[in-house]
């Protein structure tokens, strides 16, 4: 049972978003008193795996040599010390890309946009999907979800941006996901470069919901405005 021990830290290397077939290592770091580490995967029998600590005993390694759908999901880890089991770590969400073919990302009316104007990024899938994600490269909070409600699936999602400022410029990709699991994503779309022309003195956009109060311009999450054009899709922030 969970004792007063501090919770361990759980992370993945090289990251928590892994392409199908690639290797990933999950690390659980506890204390020097740890005698055993346990990794639990949501909706799987516990424990999912157990490992002895690596010297100097404050962490353990859980290796996945080749990423597949079975490994995608939500993990927590614990460690056991002489006084009992620790509290669970914060969850780690291990996401696999390559589960589905890549969607198509385009900009309407054009990827060249004047500051102060509007642009809509359109992520389209030739087969029906229920979640679309837009990612901006080098953003600290890159994920913006559009998820369909009531299991209704869509062929596309629109991500409107207005007014556009220099902060919106950059490279975007989108992913799509099926209802099987939100931890399984498509291959990434081909990149789309959004080029914002106009004043270099653009004001910072004032987001309707700031994900990180200490974020710099490149860390600002994408802030689309207006209603979601497909009524079956609902906006979800990560």
């Amino acid at each position: 049972q969970a004792g007063p021990l501090p919770k361990p830290t759980l992370w993945a290397e090289p990251g928590s978003v892994i392409s199908w077939g690639n290797s990933v290592t999950i690390w659980c770091q506890g204390t020097l008193e740890a005698r055993e580490y346990r990794l639990d995967k949501e909706e799987s029998p516990a424990p999912w795996d157990r490992q002895n600590p690596l010297e100097p005993k404050n962490k353990a390694r859980f290796s996945i040599p080749s990423m597949t759908e079975d490994y995608a999901g939500r993990y927590r880890c614990y460690y056991r010390s002489p006084v009992g089991w620790s509290q669970p770590s914060d969850p780690l969400e291990l996401v696999m890309t390559g589960a589905y073919s890549k969607p198509t990302l385009s900009a309407l009316p054009s990827p060249l946009v004047t500051s102060g104007k509007s642009v809509t990024l359109l992520c389209q899938s030739r087969s029906p999907m229920d979640t679309f994600l837009l990612i901006k490269e080098r953003a600290a909070h890159p994920l913006l979800h559009l998820r369909s409600e009531h299991g209704a699936q869509q062929h596309q999602a629109e991500f409107p941006m207005s007014p556009v400022t220099s902060v919106h410029g950059g490279t975007y990709r989108c992913f799509s996901s099926h209802g099987f699991s939100h931890y399984l994503l498509s291959h990434p779309s081909d990149p789309l470069e959004l080029i914002v022309s106009g004043s270099l003195e653009d004001p910072r956009p004032s987001p309707t919901r700031s994900v990180s109060t200490a974020a710099g311009p490149e860390d600002q999450p994408l802030m689309p405005t207006g209603s979601v054009p497909h009524s079956g899709l609902r906006r979800h922030w990560e």
Epitope: E69, M96, G98, S101, Q124, R126, S127, H178, S186
Partner: antibody, heavy 120, light 110 residues
């Protein structure tokens, strides 16, 4: 050379089964493509049978008329796609093509086709 | 379901003629429409994708236009090699489709 090559066609009796193969070369079936099976009865137009997504999950969709008689599968290790056809009827007599959906959502690569004749 | 209706089903024309084939979708398919040319005993050949983009190696006398539900394939000056059957196809893949192709248009010598 990038190509698709179908095989496995031939004469089969009504009610019988047949498995067609589509071997890909010059590209990987596990990369980001959809592959479709399309057929063409003698003197008729093109008819979509179904498609499989090359992503690891391998989602498949079928034309409404298929009604479970045909199954599309793949073997990534052999870079080959299959069409399993059961309960064949005379009206299934056709040339069967596999074709790749490119980034432009069009069928940019076709096999040469394989003839299936269902007759007693 | 998305139904693709091509017209005419047969078209008689002469070398040098301007030829137009129409494809209508029963609901909007945006610009995800392709056109193919097929000759007897051969696999179809991609001519145009995304409604108006010419595929590699296709002569410039072929052009496509339209979006939403109405699409057109035009051959500006019909050549002897162009007598064939032409098909349109939408790019969506779903489980509620009878077919993704139009019924075809045979272009024959007048």
């Amino acid at each position: 050379e990038v190509q698709l090559v179908e095989s496995g066609g031939g004469l089969v009796q009504p009610g019988g089964s047949l498995r067609l193969s589509c071997a890909a070369s010059g590209f990987s079936l596990s990369s980001s493509y959809w592959i479709s099976w399309v057929r063409q009865a003698p003197g008729k137009g093109l008819e979509w049978i179904g498609s499989i997504d090359s992503g690891s999950v391998g989602i498949t969709y079928y034309a409404t008329w298929v009604k479970g008689r045909f199954t599309i599968s793949r073997d990534n290790s052999k870079n080959t796609l299959y069409l399993q056809m059961n309960s064949l009827r005379a009206e299934d007599t056709a040339v069967y093509y596999c074709a790749r959906h490119g980034d432009n959502w069009a069928l940019d690569l076709w096999g040469q086709g394989t003839l299936v004749t269902v007759s007693s | 379901d998305i139904q693709m209706t091509q017209s005419p089903s047969t078209l008689s024309a002469s070398v040098g003629d301007r030829v137009t084939i129409t494809c209508r979708a029963s609901q909007s398919i945006n610009s995800w429409l392709a056109w193919y040319q097929q000759k007897p005993g051969k696999a179809p050949k991609l001519l145009i994708y995304k409604a108006s983009t010419l595929a590699s190696g296709v002569p410039s006398r072929f052009s496509g236009s339209g979006s939403g539900t109405e699409f057109t394939l035009t051959i500006s000056s019909l050549q002897p090699d162009d007598f064939a059957t032409y098909y349109c196809q939408h790019g969506y893949i779903r489980g509620d489709l009878d077919n993704v192709f139009g019924g075809g248009t045979k272009v024959e010598i007048k």
